[in-house]
């Protein structure tokens, strides 16, 4: 039974280029050396994994090459950036943190960040 406290902002507005950034912060009960961070998207009763990364404390956060996420870590704080977002991707993005090693295993789920994405208006044709 190990539900850590995980904090994340309630609302974030993506940039016109479809990029959204937010901080996911967790209160570690122990001295974890290996941490796994997962971003989940919840729509109604469906939960899908957006991206995930495992990192060693003090090292950089590494997502897979084809991931839409990038991030950096500092202590018990992870700065997450999701790119390539479109209006249809507007929704609740949940930060899940797992302390993988050493035991004991701890898990925490944030309340979610509502990311709003507005597709940019197409540029009007120029008459030249």
């Amino acid at each position: 039974c190990k539900a850590m406290h995980v904090a994340q902002p309630a609302v974030v507005l993506a940039s016109s280029r479809g990029i959204a950034s937010f901080v996911c912060e967790y209160a570690s009960p122990g001295k974890a050396t290996e941490v796994r961070v997962t971003v989940l998207r919840q729509a109604d009763s469906q939960v899908t994994e957006v991206c995930a990364a495992t990192y060693m404390m003090g090292n950089e956060l590494t997502f897979l090459d084809d991931s839409i996420c990038t991030g950096t870590s500092s202590g018990n704080q992870v700065n997450l950036t999701i790119q390539g977002l479109r209006a249809m991707d507007t929704g609740l993005y949940i930060c899940k943190v797992e302390l993988m090693y050493p035991p004991p295993y701890y898990l925490g789920i944030g309340n979610g960040t509502q990311i709003y994405v507005i597709d940019p208006e197409p540029c009007p044709d120029s008459d030249f």
Epitope: A3, Q42, V47, E98
Partner: antibody, heavy 115, light 108 residues
Framework: EVKLDETGGGLVQPGRPLKLSCVAS????????MNWVRQSPEKGLEWVAQ??????????YYSDSVKGRFTISRDDSKSSVYLQMNNLRVEDMGIYYC??????WGQGTSVTVSS | DIQMTQSPASLSASVGETVTITCGAS??????LNWYQQKQGKSPQLLIY???NLADGMSSRFSGSGSGRQYSLKISSLHPDDAATYYC??????????FGGGTKLEIK
């Protein structure tokens, strides 16, 4: 080697108190949230109580069935966790396990409530 | 409170077979689920944590999967030693951290 040794179980009359103790070794006790879980043939495994550690201000949580009657406590200097059970009922009978996180389990101590 | 429904309550299978045990939560639990193995007369042992991660010292024939509200434990190439009762448990706050009712596995 990880060890959790529960003691204090036994036969007790309904309405009477009983205190269980658990001594841990082989892991960093202060990093663990400690729990008591009980098991009976009627109810299977049932989580009873949890006490978190210093970074979480030793917060305590209880199942509804024991709230107000049971108290969980810990002594990090002795790597020990306790369960004070008051006003025991017949339905509290079972094997009580002490767990470190949920990763480590003791061998259990049996509690029988009968007049 | 979130309820955990485990099925089947019991099953019997032969050595070498593959079996699957399922656990359903009454609400989304985001993979916050553990599986335990309890052999006759012994304490439960952590088998799978966080829905998919195999606990130290456990055979790789055990695997966990699932998301949202539905989770499963798969045991491949059954051994006689796998005879036990298996429990799932929700480890998501708030409490209680409820267990499923258990699945008793008998090896023929």
């Amino acid at each position: 080697e990880v060890k959790l040794d529960e003691t204090g179980g036994g036969l007790v009359q309904p309405g009477r108190p009983l205190k269980l103790s658990c001594v841990a070794s082989g892991f960093t006790f202060s990093d663990n949230w400690m729990n008591w879980v009980r098991q009976s043939p009627e109810k299977g495994l049932e989580w009873v109580a949890q006490i978190r550690n210093k970074p979480y201000n030793y917060e305590t949580y209880y199942s509804d069935s024991v709230k107000g009657r049971f108290t969980i406590s810990r002594d990090d200097s002795k790597s020990s966790v306790y369960l004070q059970m008051n006003n025991l009922r017949v339905e509290d009978m079972g094997i009580y396990y002490c767990t470190g996180g949920m990763d480590y389990w003791g061998q259990g101590t049996s509690v029988t409530v009968s007049s | 409170d979130i309820q955990m429904t485990q099925s089947p309550a019991s099953l019997s299978a032969s050595v070498g077979e593959t079996v699957t045990i399922t656990c359903g939560a009454s609400e989304i639990i985001y993979g916050a689920l553990n599986w335990y193995q309890q052999k006759q007369g012994k304490s439960p042992q952590l088998l799978i944590y966080g829905a998919t991660n195999l606990a130290d010292g456990m055979s790789s024939r055990f695997s966990g999967s699932g998301s949202g509200r539905q989770y499963s434990l798969k045991i491949s190439s059954l051994h006689p030693d796998d005879a036990a009762t298996y429990y799932c448990q929700k480890i998501l706050s708030p409490p209680p951290w409820t267990f499923g009712g258990g699945t008793k596995l008998e090896i023929k």
